[in-house]
């Protein structure tokens, strides 16, 4: 029998290679049973996760899962870093794994590196 606890399914050690100036949607997959929990996004600053206030967020529904989406319109160089979503459920806080955004500032790059080039960077591979 499946648990009816809220689950946040951000993949562990996941990352996204994105470009400044582009739009980007960061998704937090949420599994719940009856009542949709309140979900928030935060950005890691060392060991502290700072809640993101006043940002454009939305919900998307799929068959067995909902997604709480953080919109970047557009991505800024300062958006580089790790993010986590958390849910309030029965007075408890459930935290997701963190996911990392690697932002390439197109102003400082002569051309966009390919995904393979991004993946070959040691700081990306072993972050």
């Amino acid at each position: 029998k499946e648990s009816c606890d809220v689950q946040l399914y951000i993949k562990r050690q996941s990352y996204h290679s994105i470009f400044a100036g582009d739009p980007f949607k960061l998704e937090c997959p949420v599994k719940y049973c009856a009542h949709r929990p309140q979900v928030t996004w935060c950005k890691l600053n060392g060991t502290t996760c700072v809640k993101l206030e006043g940002r454009h967020t939305s919900w998307k529904q799929e068959k067995n899962l909902s997604f709480f989406i953080l919109h970047f319109e557009p991505v800024l160089p300062s958006d580089n870093g790790s993010y986590r979503c958390s849910a309030n459920f029965l007075s408890a806080i459930i935290e997701s794994h963190s996911t990392t955004l690697y932002v390439t500032d197109v102003k400082s790059a002569s051309e966009r590196p390919s995904k393979d080039e991004m993946a070959s960077r040691p700081w990306l591979l072993y972050s």
């Epitope: 993949k11 996941s14 591979l125």
Partner: antibody, heavy 119, light 112 residues
Framework: QVQLVQSGAEVKKPGASVKLSCKAS????????AHWVRQAPGQGLEWIGR????????KYDPKFQGRATMTADTASNTAYLELSSLRSEDTAVYYC????????????WGQGTLVTVSS | DIVMTQTPLSLSVTPGQPASISCKSS???????????LNWFQQRPGQSPRRLIY???KLDSGVPDRFSGSGSGTDFTLKISRVEAEDVGVYYC?????????FGQGTKLEIK
């Protein structure tokens, strides 16, 4: 239930390439990682790498970087591993492995594909 | 890379008797999220591996409760309280805290 069905055995010559497939069913392919692990005859298990099917992002053991290429097709729920410049030491059973919602805990294993590299 | 060292490499056990396998990692496997990504896998002859234990001590569904896992940091143990004939095979520890993920070299369990 979760099922990972891998392609059939392959015999290749040294220097050739091989592309293995792993068709997933019974879970949401996009919301997990697909890993590849190999086992040479009579030897232990060796992690090759993993792919995030949702965006194609990969992580490889540096030993395989440049020679192994993992891809995934979310339309057919299939993960692929291509290994190039084959040598006799690549003779092994190759397993695809899925985990529960990207936990990276190697939950579900395919039946394995034997790749034999011989001249 | 993190080196996972298993001992013993083989053991022969009388049915009904206990068995214990040790796994030591070259670095602490405690992740920044507070979890320790240490699993144990069983590979029976001619079969694919299957996970027995994840996150050090959590038993997978369908795994008999005679199997247990313990440990922290760099030292981990798989115990079988009463070995049965169906337990024959090779047991591997595995770490998923650091890239690249690595397995121990395996411990072969035989029945006396």
């Amino acid at each position: 239930q979760v099922q990972l069905v891998q392609s059939g055995a392959e015999v290749k010559k040294p220097g050739a390439s091989v592309k293995l497939s792993c068709k997933a069913s019974g879970y949401n392919f996009k919301h997990t990682y697909a890993h590849w692990v190999r086992q040479a005859p009579g030897q232990g298990l060796e992690w090759i790498g993993r792919i995030d099917p949702a965006n194609g992002n990969t992580k490889y053991d540096p030993k395989f970087q440049g020679r192994a290429t993992m891809t995934a097709d979310t339309a057919s729920n299939t993960a692929y591993l291509e290994l190039s410049s084959l040598r006799s030491e690549d003779t092994a059973v190759y397993y695809c492995v899925a985990d529960h919602y990207g936990s990276s805990l190697l939950d579900y294993w395919g039946q394995g594909t034997l790749v034999t590299v011989s001249s | 890379d993190i080196v996972m060292t298993q001992t013993p490499l083989s053991l022969s056990v009388t049915p009904g008797q206990p068995a214990s396998i040790s796994c030591k990692s070259s670095q602490s496997l405690l992740d920044s999220d507070g979890k320790t990504y240490l699993n144990w896998f069983q590979q029976r002859p001619g079969q694919s591996p299957r996970r027995l234990i994840y996150l050090v001590s959590k038993l997978d569904s369908g795994v008999p409760d005679r199997f247990s896992g313990s440990g922290s940091g760099t030292d981990f143990t798989l115990k079988i309280s009463r070995v049965e004939a169906e337990d024959v095979g090779v047991y591997y520890c595995w770490q998923g805290t650091y890239f690249p993920y690595t397995f121990g070299q395996g411990t072969k369990l035989e029945i006396k």
